[in-house]
Amino acid sequence: MMTGTIETTGNISAKKGGSVILQCHLSSTMAQVTQVNWEQHDHSLLAIRNAELGWHIYPAFKDRVAPGPGLGLTLQSLTMNDTGEYFCTYHTYPDGTYRGRIFLEVLESSVAEHSARFQIP
């Protein structure tokens, strides 16, 4: 039985050209997290964090995606095209799969100044 819950940063906004941290946290379960996958709105894979082999950044994103902090993901050099949904998928044993959703809105610099959480200065 799956007892865990995923907490995410929810809806966030960040400046064009800036960086933002996407964070998910799995709680209320003793299941072993074997892997966390990060996907973009079109279901393309951004990165994998495997418990045994570590981080793997999809080659197409290696210049704009940085691992961490923790199981989170840092997106850099944001463009307006980065606006959209992001998903964290926790693969666990024995529970199975948990999935969280974050919506990122990339704003022109002047609009975004006071609205981003988890944003890197």
Epitope: N37, S44, E52, K62
Partner: antibody
Framework: QVQLVQSGAEVKKPGASVKVSCKAS????????MHWVRQAPGQGLEWMGI????????SYARKFQGRVTMTRDTSTSTVYMELSSLRSEDTAVYYC??????????????WGQGTMVTVSS | EIVMTQSPATLSVSPGERATLSCRAS??????LAWYQQKPGQAPRLLIY???TRATGIPARFSGSGSGTEFTLTISSLQSEDFAVYYC??????????FGGGTKVEIK
């Protein structure tokens, strides 16, 4: 050219261990993951595990954890797969196969010729 | 683990005809899917990776498509050397990386 050459066929008794070698040539050994896949007679392909030859990190299928050990010798560009506590169901052809670069998992693009392991009393 | 299901288990096709093989993943693997060909007594050979990219030296009659959970391998005009067993495999979640059960393409 890129190739993987495996050790010869083995016949083992139940309870014994077997160690199969796989020597790589024609590419930079440390830069690519190595996988082990087995195939029982008349059956499909079964993934056993993976090793990062650069740093020795491994990840094993849960089914084999505690019985399988994958190691490497960078000086000879050779990986090894040892399976212990053998039983008749372990009778199979064992393949090593090169995966993607260690920055991304990738498909299995180069395969060894296979090593037949027969477990019989 | 991600379960890969191939269909049909056996496909009977005449030489020169088109063959369409299916592979379904129990959850999204994005485009991280490969197809392999295996002939009796031989090691598998990589045909397609990234769901649709042909591996080096693979003839153009082999093509892959799909994304997410549904994938297809098409052999446009079967040659005698194409009769073999074909496996799909996901390489996005591990352990374990998982293979489908295989589709045997036989001569009709």
């Amino acid at each position: 050219q890129v190739q993987l050459v495996q050790s010869g066929a083995e016949v083992k008794k139940p309870g014994a261990s077997v160690k199969v070698s796989c020597k790589a040539s024609g590419y930079t050994f440390r830069e690519y993951y190595m996988h082990w896949v087995r195939q029982a007679p008349g059956q499909g392909l079964e993934w056993m595990g993976i090793i990062n030859p650069s740093i020795g990190l491994t990840s094993y299928a849960r089914k084999f954890q505690g019985r399988v050990t994958m190691t490497r010798d960078t000086s000879t560009s050779t990986v090894y797969m040892e399976l212990s506590s053998l039983r008749s169901e372990d009778t199979a052809v064992y393949y090593c196969a090169r995966g993607g670069r260690t920055t991304w998992i990738g498909a299995l693009d180069i395969w060894g010729q296979g090593t037949m392991v027969t477990v019989s009393s | 683990e991600i379960v890969m299901t191939q269909s049909p288990a056996t496909l009977s096709v005449s030489p020169g005809e088109r063959a369409t093989l299916s592979c379904r993943a129990s959850q999204s693997v994005s485009s991280n899917l490969a197809w392999y060909q295996q002939k009796p007594g031989q090691a598998p050979r990589l045909l397609i990776y990234g769901a649709s990219t042909r591996a080096t030296g693979i003839p153009a009659r082999f093509s892959g498509s799909g994304s997410g959970t549904e994938f297809t391998l098409t052999i446009s005009s079967l040659q005698s050397e194409d009769f073999a067993v074909y496996y799909c495999q996901q390489y996005v979640v591990w352990p374990p990386l998982t293979f489908g059960g295989g589709t045997k393409v036989e001569i009709k």
